[in-house]
């Protein structure tokens, strides 16, 4: 999904006529079209600030099949996504939630949960340590031909 | 070594069930996601739902609700589907998939071919 | 749902030469489409991720491109190998769906 912008809610208001850009600016909630601050469509785009050279509202982000909507989409803030239940975003893969680890391995112990922005996290038993990484047994791989397995994904 | 291992073809009546199996070896099924994938004879691929098997949250495609159970055994790292009512239309190969993450298919079993004939 | 459209159903190509296998969204999946391949008699294989991602142990002459809904598989120069079927999905969003597949035979 894109960047969610978290602005606060605004009222969208009324079509209001300018004469110039330099006037003022639409409010959030509008964008400018032939010298007019028109609003943008609930549920379809929106314009999170107030501005005076947007010529199109901000199409609404649409939550992806790994995701859960927190909030819909309104005329001044984009929809919040989150990721399901039982999975993370990636700092390097943001656009992407991956499965949470339900273990931690031999030696070391669980000291964080999974939550929608990170993996359990897992400090070894004497040191104290993070661990950071996969647990090998759940490496990404792909088959050469059923049943067998190749080397693991990028 | 991670693999798939799918019970063998069945041969089942029209209107009866079946429950197909897919024991995994290599990884813990509680840390991916297990899909269940249709091919029926000379056809393409149909995606039938997904669990997880951490919380048992399913996901089905709407033709396949009611037609297909997703169920998992954590202790045994063994994944289930059942099919009921079935039809001479539910013949097919049904593979059970893994992914570490939901959006697509990074391993499959080798598949268990079900023939409903009377 | 989201319907995939994959042409030609089948490509007749000699070994060696450019495969170019292309595969429609009937709406924007942004780049949440993956590609695998599928011999006679085994489970399909996953070739690319995420429209354009490689795959470690799939050689690179498979490459994958395209974004929001219109995508395309090149194999850069077929090898005996390479003749099978080939499925496009797409993951954006419930359920996910397949396109009807592409054969690819040699000429």
């Known amino acids: 999904i894109t960047q969610q912008d978290l602005a606060p809610q605004q009222r969208a208001a009324p079509q209001q006529k300018r004469s110039s850009p330099s006037e003022g600016p639409c409010l959030a909630g509008q964008y400018l079209s032939e010298g007019n601050c028109k609003p943008c469509r609930e549920g379809i785009d929106y314009t999170s600030h107030s501005n005076h050279s947007l010529d199109s509202c901000i199409l609404c982000t649409r939550c992806d099949s790994g995701e859960v909507e927190l909030s819909p989409c309104t005329t001044t803030r984009n929809t919040v996504c989150q990721c399901e239940e039982g999975t993370f975003r990636e700092e390097d893969s943001p656009e992407m939630c991956r499965k949470c680890r339900t273990g931690c391995p031999r030696g070391m112990v669980k000291v964080g949960d999974c939550t929608p922005w990170s993996d359990i996290e897992c400090v070894h038993k004497e040191s104290g340590t993070k661990h950071s990484g996969e647990v090998p047994a759940v490496e990404e791989t792909v088959t050469s031909s059923p049943g067998t397995p190749a080397s693991p994904c990028s | 070594e991670v693999q798939l291992q799918q019970s063998g073809a069945e041969v089942v009546k029209p209107g009866a069930s079946v429950k197909l199996s897919c024991k995994a070896s290599?990884?813990?099924?509680?840390?991916?996601?297990i899909h269940w994938v249709k091919q029926a004879p000379g056809q393409g691929l149909e995606w039938i739902g997904r669990i997880d098997p951490a919380n048992g949250n399913t996901k089905y495609d709407p033709k396949f609700q009611g037609k297909a159970t997703i169920t998992t055994d954590t202790s045994s790292n063994t994944a289930y589907m059942e099919l009921s009512s079935l039809r001479s239309e539910d013949t097919a190969v049904y593979y059970c998939?893994?992914?570490?993450?939901?959006?697509?298919?990074?391993?499959w079993g080798q598949g268990t071919l079900v023939t409903v004939s009377s | 749902e989201i319907v995939m459209t994959q042409s030609p159903a089948t490509l007749s190509v000699s070994p060696g030469e450019r495969a170019t296998l292309s595969c429609r969204a009937s709406?924007?999946?942004?780049?949440?489409l993956h590609w695998y391949q599928q011999k006679p008699g085994q489970a399909p294989r996953l070739l690319i991720k995420f429209a354009s991602q490689s795959i470690t142990g799939i050689p690179a002459r498979f490459s994958g491109s395209g974004s929001g809904t219109e995508f395309t598989l090149t194999i850069s120069s077929l090898q005996s190998e390479d003749f099978a079927v080939y499925y496009c999905?797409?993951?954006?969003?419930?359920?996910?769906?397949f396109g009807q597949g592409t054969k690819l035979e040699i000429k």
């Open positions: 709406q924007s999946i942004s780049n949440n």
């Open positions: 999905q797409q993951g954006n969003s419930w359920p996910y769906t």
């Open positions: 290599g990884f813990n099924i509680k840390d991916t996601f």
């Open positions: 998939v893994r992914g570490l993450y939901t959006y697509y298919f990074d391993y």
